[in-house]
């Protein structure tokens, strides 16, 4: 997992709430699941289910947990050391170049093409030309064959946010 979490909001600054455990920084940094105090003398635990940190750090705030959007399912909840993992619902997918939303998978291939790949949470169905075997560009076909796809079973999350 990377140190820079993509576009995560910061959790509200955490003053010493009673439920937040404190410990001393180790060599000036705080462990995963904690952030550093403003004077640099304490490590303060993140709040389970609200915020997190994944690395040894000198963050002044833990990072706010991602909330899965409608159209997504939660694969694993947010812990103090790992962000929520969200995945597109069955029949939808998220492409790397448009990660902001889940898009509906096509229900079939254009005429003259055959389906070689199912809809998965991270890819649309894959169509190839019957003769040449070259891939279809992915535009929604004007005319669809009666061949339809069944949503693929997810093998891994399509979007790791943390």
């Amino acid at each position: 997992e990377s140190a820079l979490i993509t576009q995560q909001d910061l959790a509200p600054q955490q003053r010493a709430a009673p439920q937040q455990k404190r410990s001393s920084p180790s060599e000036g940094l705080c462990p995963p699941g904690h952030h550093i105090s403003e004077d640099g003398r304490d490590c303060i635990s993140c709040k389970y289910g609200q915020d997190y940190s994944t690395h040894w750090n000198d963050l002044l705030f833990c990072l706010r947990c991602t909330r899965c959007d409608s159209g997504e399912v939660e694969l694993s909840p947010c812990t103090t050391t790992r962000n929520t993992v969200c995945q597109c619902e069955e029949g939808t997918f998220r492409e790397e170049d448009s990660p902001e939303m889940c898009r509906k998978c096509r229900t079939g291939c254009p005429r003259g093409m055959v389906k070689v790949g199912d809809c998965t949470p991270w890819s649309d169905i894959e169509c190839v030309h019957k003769e040449s075997g070259t891939k279809h560009s992915g535009e929604v076909p004007a005319v669809e064959e009666t061949v339809t796809s069944s949503p693929g079973t997810p093998a891994s999350p399509c979007s790791l946010s943390g």
């Epitope: 820079l4 910061l10 940094l29 002044l60 705030f61």
Partner: antibody, heavy 119, light 106 residues
Framework: EVMLVESGGGLVQPGGSLRLSCAAS????????MSWVRQAPGKGLEWVAT????????YYPDSVKGRFTISRDNAKNTLYLQMNSLRAEDTAVYYC????????????WGQGTLVTVSS | DIVMTQSPSSLSASVGDRVTITCKAS??????VAWYQQKPGKAPKLLIY???TRHTGVPDRFTGSGSGTDFTLTISSLQPEDFATYFC????????FGQGTKVEIK
């Protein structure tokens, strides 16, 4: 007087490697968290790596993770940045920086060393 | 990442002028903002941290203010040695910087 002096910059081909050094003096080096920050030509500054005072813990941004390694030798008062699989976009002036005592931000910087990645 | 938008990118001023540089964070960073001064070929110098605390040896003509998302560096009366580039930095979540403001002689 706090002094940080970087060295090791130069011209390297894409895919190549380079190791930068930063010689520290004027303070107890082993007590401070240290970082590398870079500035590409005509662009803003970008944090590159951070290492704990004893050298046990490190962290990096996405852009360099898995390619760059920060390390330190407290006996020699020296900070290092090993840069592998260099890309054209890594071309920048690289600064070594010290995190202050109670401010959680950089209080002293070196004057930088230029790394140019080009074929 | 938290984006720090600094303005203006450059300005021309005369000795004795009052100069104001602003920095806007893309989300709340509390008061975890520092301001630095840099001259060509030199190391950046810390001026202000925690948004308004002057670093050791920094003249009192340099003043920082703001909290949340809006921050300002003010030089009350510009001196010849103040012509330089200034940049802001947030340090609440990792470290990100403004693009810099070049203060030039009018």
């Amino acid at each position: 007087e706090v002094m940080l002096v970087e060295s090791g910059g130069g011209l390297v081909q894409p895919g190549g490697s380079l190791r930068l050094s930063c010689a520290a003096s004027g303070f107890t080096f082993s007590s401070y968290v240290m970082s590398w920050v870079r500035q590409a030509p005509g662009k803003g500054l970008e944090w590159v790596a951070t290492i704990s005072s004893g050298g046990s813990y490190t962290y990096y941004p996405d852009s360099v993770k898995g390619r760059f390694t920060i390390s330190r030798d407290n006996a020699k008062n020296t900070l290092y940045l090993q840069m592998n699989s260099l890309r054209a976009e890594d071309t920048a002036v690289y600064y070594c920086a010290r995190r202050g005592d109670s401010m959680i931000t950089t209080d002293y910087w070196g004057q930088g060393t230029l790394v140019t990645v080009s074929s | 990442d938290i984006v720090m938008t600094q303005s203006p990118s450059s300005l021309s001023a005369s000795v004795g002028d009052r100069v104001t540089i602003t920095c806007k964070a893309s989300q709340d960073v509390g008061t975890a903002v520092a301001w630095y001064q840099q001259k060509p070929g030199k190391a950046p110098k810390l001026l202000i941290y925690w948004a308004s605390t002057r670093h050791t040896g920094v003249p009192d003509r340099f003043t920082g203010s703001g909290s949340g998302t809006d921050f300002t560096l003010t030089i009350s009366s510009l001196q010849p040695e103040d012509f330089a580039t200034y940049f802001c930095q947030q340090y609440s979540s990792y470290r990100t910087f403004g693009q810099g403001t070049k203060v030039e002689i009018k």
